[in-house]
C-alpha cells in the first residue's frame, strides 16, 4: 500500500457516548488537522474510507454498514449510529484518499453504561454560575445536527435523579434550564433527555453537565494581602531561620490567572545568590474564591539578609498589588555578667 | 446586621383590602429573594409569596393568586404585600422572611404584623 | 404539593435530654431542607439549613441530617430556652411547605 499520512491516534478527543444512543462522530481530519473541509475533498475526488479497531484487538477491520435498520451509517465527513452498543467500543480511523493522495486519522470512541440516575464514567463538562446574580441558563449540550429544525422534541431536565418541576430557583425552557438566583446547593449535575422521533423510531439523547457556582464577577475586588502586614515584625538573629508568609485572597474570575510572587531587594528569589526557598499552597472557597499561600525561607540568615526588603507581590485579572515584610534585626539581650562585674569595678 | 419590620396589619372586613410593608434597616435587604409568611392564630407556617432580588420575578400560593400582590421599592429598601378581596381565612401574622443568597434558607425574619379580616 | 410530615406533634422532655425530631418529605427533596425553632409572640428563627449546616451562632447541640425524604433535628442536651415549637421547611419545590410543628414542652 502507498505511503498515508498517518495523524496517529488523537488521545485529545477522546469520544465518550452513551450506550443504546445515538451517535454523530465528524472525522477529526477536516476539524483539526488539513485545511480543507470534507466538500472541498469531495468536489477534488477524494474518498473518506471509515474502519475501526475493536477494543482489546489489533486488527483494522472494515465498519459494517450493512447492519439491520442501517444502524451504522455514513453521512459526509459524519459517522452515524442509530443507537450505539457497547461492544462498538474501540479505536476509529477515517482515511482521506485517492490515487496520489492519503491522509488518516484515529480516535478513540467509548460507549458508556449509565445508571437510572445518570450516572456513568463519562467526562462532564462544567458550567460556571455566578452567585447573587440575575437570571443565567445552561444549555442542552452537543445536540445539532440529531434532528432536523421541523422536528420538535421532548425535552426533560433533571437535578442529580429528580425531575425538575416547579423548583424553587430553576425552570425549564425547552433546550435551556434557566436559573432565577444561583444558590451553592444549586451545584450538582444537571441532565437533559432529548427525545425525538425518526423513521418511525424514538431516539433517546442524554446530556448531563456539572454546575458550579462561583463568585460573582459584581463582587470581585483586587488581589487582597492579608500578610505580611504591618502589625507583624519578622524579628531575627543571625543563624535563626526565616520564614515569612505572604498570604493572598483572590476574588474569583472566570479565566483570570493569579499569580503570586516574592522579591528581595527587588529581584525575583531566583535572580539572587541567597539560599531561599519558596512553598505555595492553594485553598479555594465553596465560590471558587482563591487564598495562595507562599512561604518564604531562608534556613540561616545572616545579618546582611535582615536589612533587604522582602516584598510580596499578586496579580489578578483585577490589578496588581504588593506590600512589604518588617524584616529586622533582633537586638541581643545584655550579657548580665559581664555588665554586673563591671558595676563591682571587676576588669 | 440587617433587620426587617413590618407594619401596616389591622382589622379588615372581609372583601376589603390591606397593604403590608417590610422595611429592611441597618443595610440593604440584599440576599436570593424576599418572602411572606402567615400563621393563622394558633397555626403552623404557610408560605405565601416570593419576590426576586435581581429579577422581579414573583410567586403566589395557589391560595392567594389573584388576589395578592408582592413588590417592592429599592429605593426605598422596602417590600410590599397588597390583599384585595380579604377573606376570614386570610387571618394570619403575616412574617416578611429573607431567603439567603447562597443557601435555601430564610436567614432573617421580622417580627410579623397581625391581618384580622372580620366583620 | 409537597406534604412535611412531623413527627411527634408535642413532645414532653426534660433539661438535659436527648430529644430527635423527624420530617418526611412526600417526595425527594434532595437536601433542601431547613429547621426553625418558633417561641410564643416571637418569629421564627433558623437553626439548620441544607438538612445538615449549622446557621452561624446557633448553639453546637442542634443539629440535623438525612437526604431525599428523612430528616432528623436533635438536641443533644436540652436546655430551659429550648422549649419552643420546632419546624421543617422544604425549599426545593414550589409551593415551599412548612411541617407542622413539634412543641417541646416540660415533662
Known amino acids: 500500500s502507498e505511503r498515508c499520512d498517518d495523524w496517529g491516534l488523537d488521545t485529545m478527543r477522546q469520544i465518550q457516548v452513551f450506550e443504546d444512543e445515538p451517535a454523530r462522530i465528524k472525522c477529526p481530519l477536516f476539524e483539526h488537522f488539513l485545511k480543507f473541509n470534507y466538500s472541498t475533498a469531495h468536489s477534488a475526488g477524494l474518498t473518506l474510507i471509515w474502519y475501526w479497531t475493536r477494543q482489546d484487538r489489533d486488527l483494522e477491520e472494515p465498519i459494517n454498514f450493512r447492519l439491520p435498520e442501517n444502524r451504522i451509517s455514513k453521512e459526509k465527513d459524519v459517522l452515524w449510529f442509530r443507537p450505539t452498543l457497547l461492544n462498538d467500543t474501540g479505536n476509529y480511523t477515517c482515511m482521506l484518499r485517492n490515487t496520489t493522495y492519503c491522509s488518516k486519522v484515529a480516535f478513540p470512541l467509548e460507549v458508556v453504561q449509565k445508571d437510572s440516575c445518570f450516572n456513568s464514567p463519562m467526562k462532564l463538562p462544567v458550567h460556571k454560575l455566578y452567585i447573587e446574580y440575575g437570571i443565567q441558563r445552561i444549555t442542552c449540550p452537543n445536540v445539532d445536527g440529531y434532528f432536523p429544525s421541523s422536528v420538535k422534541p421532548t425535552i426533560t431536565w433533571y437535578m442529580g435523579c429528580y425531575k425538575i418541576q416547579n423548583f424553587n430557583n430553576v425552570i425549564p425552557e425547552g433546550m435551556n434550564l434557566s436559573f432565577l438566583i444561583a444558590l451553592i446547593s444549586n451545584n450538582g449535575n444537571y441532565t437533559c433527555v432529548v427525545t425525538y422521533p425518526e423513521n418511525g423510531r424514538t431516539f433517546h439523547l442524554t446530556r448531563t453537565l456539572t454546575v458550579k457556582v462561583v463568585g460573582s464577577p459584581k463582587n470581585a475586588v483586587p488581589p487582597v494581602i492579608h500578610s505580611p502586614n504591618d502589625h507583624v515584625v519578622y524579628e531575627k538573629e543571625p543563624g535563626e531561620e526565616l520564614l515569612i508568609p505572604c498570604t493572598v485572597y483572590f476574588s474569583f474570575l472566570m479565566d483570570s490567572r493569579n499569580e503570586v510572587w516574592w522579591t528581595i531587594d527587588g529581584k525575583k528569589p531566583d535572580d539572587i545568590t541567597i539560599d531561599v526557598t519558596i512553598n505555595e499552597s492553594i485553598s479555594h472557597s465553596r465560590t471558587e474564591d482563591e487564598t495562595r499561600t507562599q512561604i518564604l525561607s531562608i534556613k540561616k540568615v545572616t545579618s546582611e539578609d535582615l536589612k533587604r526588603s522582602y516584598v510580596c507581590h499578586a496579580r489578578s485579572a483585577k490589578g496588581e498589588v504588593a506590600k512589604a515584610a518588617k524584616v529586622k534585626q533582633k537586638v541581643p539581650a545584655p550579657r548580665y555578667t559581664v555588665e554586673l562585674a563591671c558595676g563591682f569595678g571587676a576588669t | 446586621e440587617v433587620q426587617l419590620v413590618e407594619s401596616g396589619g389591622g382589622l379588615v372586613q372581609p372583601g376589603g383590602s390591606l397593604r403590608l410593608s417590610c422595611a429592611a434597616s441597618g443595610g440593604t435587604i440584599g440576599g436570593s429573594a424576599v418572602h411572606w409568611v402567615r400563621q393563622a392564630p394558633g397555626k403552623g407556617l404557610v408560605w405565601v409569596s416570593r419576590i426576586l432580588t435581581y429579577s422581579s420575578t414573583t410567586q403566589y400560593a395557589e391560595s392567594v393568586k389573584g388576589r395578592f400582590t408582592i413588590s417592592r421599592d429599592n429605593a426605598k429598601n422596602t417590600l410590599y404585600l397588597q390583599m384585595n378581596s380579604l377573606r376570614a381565612e386570610d387571618t394570619a401574622v403575616y412574617y416578611c422572611?429573607?431567603?439567603?443568597?447562597?443557601?435555601?434558607?430564610?436567614?432573617?425574619w421580622g417580627q410579623g404584623t397581625l391581618v384580622t379580616v372580620s366583620s | 404539593d409537597i406534604q412535611m410530615t412531623q413527627s411527634p406533634s408535642t413532645l414532653s422532655a426534660s433539661v438535659g435530654d436527648r430529644v430527635t425530631i423527624t420530617c418526611r418529605a412526600s417526595?425527594?427533596?434532595?437536601?433542601?431542607l431547613a429547621w426553625y425553632q418558633q417561641k410564643p409572640g416571637k418569629a421564627p428563627k433558623l437553626l439548620i439549613y441544607d438538612a445538615s449546616s449549622l446557621e452561624s451562632g446557633v448553639p453546637s447541640r442542634f443539629s440535623g441530617s438525612g437526604s431525599g425524604t428523612e430528616f432528623t433535628l436533635t438536641i443533644s442536651s436540652l436546655q430551659p430556652e429550648d422549649f419552643a415549637t420546632y419546624y421543617c421547611?422544604?425549599?426545593?419545590?414550589?409551593?415551599?411547605?412548612f411541617g407542622q410543628g413539634t412543641k417541646v414542652e416540660i415533662k
Open positions: 422572611a429573607r431567603g439567603s443568597s447562597e443557601y435555601p434558607k430564610f436567614d432573617i
Open positions: 421547611h422544604q425549599l426545593l419545590i414550589y409551593p415551599h411547605t
Open positions: 417526595q425527594s427533596i434532595s437536601s433542601w
